[in-house]
Interface confidence: medium
C-alpha cells in the first residue's frame, strides 16, 4: 500500500485525478526524479542559443552558445558576445585593452601585466594587449658567479689556503 | 505515532455503518497516504480503498467496493469508510493503515440477519 | 481486476533453514510497486519488504524480497520460530481503480 503519487517513476508525473496514477510527461516536458505532481516544461535553444543535448522525457535540454557567443552562468544560462584576444566586452561592445593590460581569451576582462620588479625580476618579454609579459631572471642573477648554471668550485681539502 | 479503528459493529443485510480511523500524533490536514483493507474470518486480506489526506485527489477503490463504499477525511485526525446495502460477505475485520507501513488494530463488523 | 497467486499453503520448515515464497501477478506490477506483509492471528499486517526488494525499517536481513514484472519472491533464511505467520504479497497497478491486490496468503509452519 505504497502512496503510489510519491513512487511514480522518472518521465511520468502524478496525474491522480484521471484513469492513471502515474501518466507519461506530455511532450516538450520532462520530470527527472520520481514522485513529481507536475512535469516541468523543456528548455528551448533559440535565438543565440543552440541545443547541445534534446530534452527527454527525464532529463531536459542543454544548450550552448551559437559561434561568436560563450556561454555563462549556471547550465549555460546566458549567452555573451566573443571579442578577440586583446579586446574585453564593453556596454558599448568590444573594446581594445588599454596599454598596460591583455587579454588572452575571447571572453573576460583586460587584466595588468604582472610587475616583473614586484619578485625582483626583469622583463624578459614585453607585453602585448593579447600576451603577458615574461619576466626574466632578477638583475643579479645576471652578475658573473651568480648563475645557477656556473659549476660549483671544486671543494678545497681543509687547512689548505687559496692561492 | 498509531491509529485507530472504530465503529464495527453487528447490523442486518442491508444496513449501513461508518467506520472512523483514528489517528494519535499524525495531522492528516498534511498529505498521507490512507487505506482500508479488510480480512473476512480465516481469510486474507482484501484490499478497500485508498485516499490521499490533505488533498483533493480521486481516491483509489477495488471495483467491488465502489460506489458502495466511500473513503473520506471527516478531520484532521479522522479518515472514514462508509458502507452502504451491507451484506454477510462484508462480514469481516476492517483495518486501517497509512502507506502500508503503520496500521490499526482493526475493526469487526458483523452482517447478520 | 488483478489477480495475485502465491505458493500454496502451508509450507513447512526448519528452525535455522530458508523458505521461498513465490507470488505471480495476472498484469505487470507497475514500476515495482510491490510489497510483502506477515501477519500473525489477531494482529495487523506488518510490511517487511516494499518496492520489491526494499527492507522495512527494523526488520532483519534475513527477509529477502526479488523479482520485477509478474514474478516476484520472499525468501527467509536462518529460520526462526518467530517467522511462523501467514505472509501476504501486494501488487500496485497504474489504474485508479483496483490499484492494489493482495495474494491469497502463505503460512510458514514448522515442522
Known amino acids: 500500500l505504497q502512496d503510489l503519487c510519491s513512487n511514480c517513476p522518472a518521465g511520468t508525473f502524478c496525474d491522480n485525478n484521471r484513469s492513471q496514477i502515474c501518466s507519461p510527461c506530455p511532450p516538450n516536458s520532462f520530470s527527472s526524479a520520481g514522485g513529481q505532481r507536475t512535469c516541468d516544461i523543456c528548455r528551448q535553444c533559440k535565438g543565440v542559443f543552440k541545443t547541445r543535448k534534446e530534452c527527454s522525457s527525464t532529463s531536459n535540454a542543454e544548450c550552448d552558445c551559437i559561434s561568436g557567443y560563450h556561454c555563462l552562468g549556471a547550465e549555460c544560462s546566458m549567452c555573451e558576445q566573443d571579442c578577440k584576444q586583446g579586446q574585453e566586452l564593453t556596454k558599448k561592445g568590444c573594446k581594445d585593452c588599454c596599454f598596460g593590460t591583455f587579454n588572452d581569451q575571447k571572453r573576460g576582462i583586460c587584466r595588468p601585466w604582472t610587475n616583473c620588479s614586484l619578485d625582483g625580476k626583469s622583463v624578459l618579454v614585453n607585453g602585448t594587449k593579447e600576451r603577458d609579459v615574461v619576466c626574466g631572471p632578477s638583475p643579479a642573477d645576471l652578475s658573473p658567479g651568480a648563475s645557477s648554471a656556473t659549476p660549483p668550485a671544486p671543494a678545497r681539502e681543509p687547512g689548505h689556503s687559496p692561492q | 505515532e498509531s491509529l485507530e479503528e472504530s465503529g464495527g459493529d453487528l447490523v442486518k443485510p442491508g444496513a449501513s455503518l461508518t467506520l472512523t480511523c483514528t489517528a494519535s500524533g499524525i495531522d492528516f490536514s498534511r498529505r498521507y497516504y490512507m487505506c482500508w483493507v479488510r480480512q473476512a474470518p480465516g481469510k486474507g486480506l482484501e484490499w478497500i480503498a485508498c485516499?490521499?489526506?490533505?488533498?483533493?485527489?480521486?481516491p483509489h477503490y477495488a471495483s467491488w467496493a465502489k460506489g458502495r463504499f466511500t473513503i473520506s477525511q471527516t478531520s484532521s485526525t479522522t479518515v472514514t469508510l462508509q458502507m452502504t446495502s451491507l451484506t454477510a460477505a462484508d462480514t469481516a475485520t476492517y483495518f486501517c493503515?497509512?502507506?502500508?507501513?503503520?496500521w490499526g488494530p482493526g475493526t469487526l463488523v458483523t452482517v447478520s440477519s | 481486476a488483478q489477480v495475485l497467486t502465491q505458493t500454496a499453503s502451508p509450507v513447512s520448515a526448519a528452525v535455522g533453514g530458508t523458505v521461498t515464497i513465490n507470488c505471480q501477478s495476472s498484469?505487470?506490477?507497475?514500476?515495482?510497486?510491490f510489497s510483502w506483509y506477515q501477519q500473525k492471528p489477531g494482529q495487523p499486517p506488518k510490511l517487511l519488504i516494499y518496492?520489491?526488494?526494499t527492507l522495512a525499517s527494523g526488520v532483519p536481513s534475513r527477509f529477502k524480497g526479488s523479482g520485477s514484472g509478474t514474478q516476484f519472491t520472499l525468501t527467509i533464511s536462518d529460520l526462526e520460530c518467530d517467522d511462523a505467520a501467514t505472509y501476504y504479497c501486494?501488487?500496485?497497478?497504474?489504474?485508479?481503480?483496483?490499484?492494489?491486490?493482495f495474494g491469497g496468503g502463505t503460512e510458514v509452519e514448522f515442522k
Open positions: 493503515a497509512r502507506e502500508g507501513n503503520l
Open positions: 501486494a501488487g500496485g497497478y497504474n489504474t485508479v481503480t483496483d490499484t492494489f491486490a
Open positions: 518496492s520489491a526488494s
Open positions: 498484469q505487470s506490477v507497475y514500476s515495482n510497486w
Open positions: 485516499m490521499y489526506t490533505g488533498s483533493r485527489d480521486t
